[in-house]
């Protein structure tokens, strides 16, 4: 965990221009606040600078939470965690961000998705997701809705079905009814993976029953 | 739901400003999205002209940009189309839109009726 | 810039006709591709945005595919209120372009 007293950082990014090239958990500073919240940085893939915003590796994390878990942030930045939607918003609406999500299956293929425009809406919206320009491997068509779906958790369904797909699919994510994706869903081990509606899901990649054995989400300035 | 009403006068002299204004109802121009203008000439040829974010922040077509302004009252839910030196050539109907996206160019999915602009001496 | 070259600039068909019309971007447009329909008289009219995605309210009909530089959009049966000017619009680069619209005109 590396802090320097004098820094505050706001992003992996700022992290990385200031000599820090490490990987590893580092203290990062709300926009406009003193508030503070840990969040692991990625200072290799692709040039460094990356904080990572989603990960789920092994299935140790149970990402079935409430509205409130969603917005602050749970789990281990070291391990399978969310970061937080309130940071993240506050963060993405202060300059443009891109946003990096890197799958791997059970097979030992690994593919991508990258936005080159990335933000979420105020708490006030239900953290809706923005998202432009899509490039990568994990599908040409893009597996979370770019519409700008709410955020929705078990004890907060905006999504645009008469069902709860929170509960159906479990996790918090940007449901739509339900749509074709949903990281934060159950962990499911290797051979139990398929047929799983409510496993973690990118459906342009690998179809709408395969649950993915890793994922993570990771953002940076998109003038990095 | 959201509606949006261009206003401003159907004609103007060449060498004079061009002044709009877009009024929104049923969503506030401060939570999200970007907020255009867009123009149609004669022949039906769309051109986008800018935005105003919800964020204040701007953004403009290079072909207007020595002339063009985008300015809002957000208390009274409206944003405002400036175009300077005009001629013969910007008459059009001008649409204002907002679009899907709030910090960059995007689809526009809720449109104004248009107003026709007439430039002539 | 990116120029959206829009064909066919004018059809004509009849009701129950299956209708394409292309654009193709002068550079990659990534998915960030919209279609307008445009009636006599009115405004444009969002039917299809991030290339494949039918919005809200729109009838299935109307489908709209693509990436990179190719898009398409089709109606499947064509019906007598589709008369209308229909436009491509990418907004993957800044300024969003339009195409040059086709005009749909019903026999």
């Known amino acids: 965990d590396y802090k320097d007293d004098d820094d505050k950082f706001r992003d992996c990014a700022e992290v990385f221009k200031s000599g820090h090239t490490t990987n590893g958990i580092y203290t990062l500073t709300f926009p406009n606040s003193t508030e503070e919240i840990k969040a692991y940085c990625d200072m290799e893939a692709g040039g460094g600078g990356w904080t990572i915003i989603q990960r789920r590796e092994d299935g140790s994390v149970d990402f079935q939470r409430t509205w409130k878990e969603y917005k602050v942030g749970f789990g281990n930045p070291s391990g399978e965690y969310w970061l937080g939607n309130e940071f993240v918003s506050q963060l993405t609406n202060q300059q443009r961000y891109v946003l990096k999500i890197h799958l791997k299956d059970w097979e030992g293929n690994e593919a991508y998705s990258l936005y080159e425009h990335f933000y979420l809406s105020s708490e006030e919206l239900n953290y809706r997701i923005h998202l432009k320009g899509l490039t990568g491997t994990a599908g040409k068509i893009s597996s979370i809705s770019q519409a700008g779906n709410d955020f929705s958790t078990k004890d907060g369904d905006n999504d645009k079905c008469i069902c709860k797909c929170s509960q159906m699919l479990t996790g918090g994510w940007w449901f739509d009814a339900c749509g074709p994706s949903n990281l934060n869903g159950m962990y499911y081990p290797q051979r139990q993976n398929t047929n799983k509606f409510n496993g973690i899901k990118w459906y342009y990649w690998k179809g709408s029953g395969y649950s993915l054995k890793a994922t993570t989400m990771m953002i940076r300035p998109a003038d990095f | 739901d959201v509606q949006l009403q261009e206003s401003g006068p159907g004609l103007v002299k060449p060498s004079q400003s061009l002044s709009l204004t877009c009024t929104v109802t049923?969503?506030?121009?401060?939570?999200?999205?970007?907020w255009n203008w867009i123009r149609q000439f004669p022949g039906n040829k769309l051109e986008w002209m800018g935005y105003?974010?919800?964020?204040?922040?701007?953004s403009y077509n290079p072909s207007l940009k020595s002339r063009i302004s985008i300015t809002r009252d957000t208390s009274k839910n409206q944003f405002f189309l400036q175009l300077n030196s005009v001629t013969p050539e910007d008459t059009a109907t001008y649409y204002c839109?907002?679009?899907?996206?709030?910090?960059?160019?995007?689809?526009?999915?809720?449109w104004g009726q248009g107003t026709s602009v007439t430039v002539s001496s | 810039s990116i120029v959206m070259t829009q064909t066919p600039k004018l059809l004509l068909v009849s009701a129950g006709d299956r209708v394409t019309i292309t654009c193709k971007a002068s550079q990659s447009a990534s998915n960030d591709v919209a279609w307008y329909q445009q009636k006599p008289g009115q405004s444009p009219k969002l039917l299809i945005y991030y290339a494949s995605n039918r919005y809200t309210g729109v009838p299935d009909r109307f489908t709209g595919s693509g990436y990179g530089t190719d898009f398409t959009f089709a109606i499947s049966t064509v019906q007598a209120e589709d008369l209308a000017i229909y436009f491509c619009?990418?907004?993957?680069?800044?300024?969003?372009?339009f195409g040059g619209g086709t005009k749909l005109e019903i026999k």
């Open positions: 049923g969503y506030s121009i401060t939570s999200d999205y970007a």
């Open positions: 839109a907002r679009s899907t996206f709030g910090h960059y160019v995007s689809s526009m999915d809720y």
């Open positions: 105003i974010s919800y964020s204040g922040s701007t």
């Open positions: 619009q990418q907004d993957y680069s800044s300024p969003p372009t």
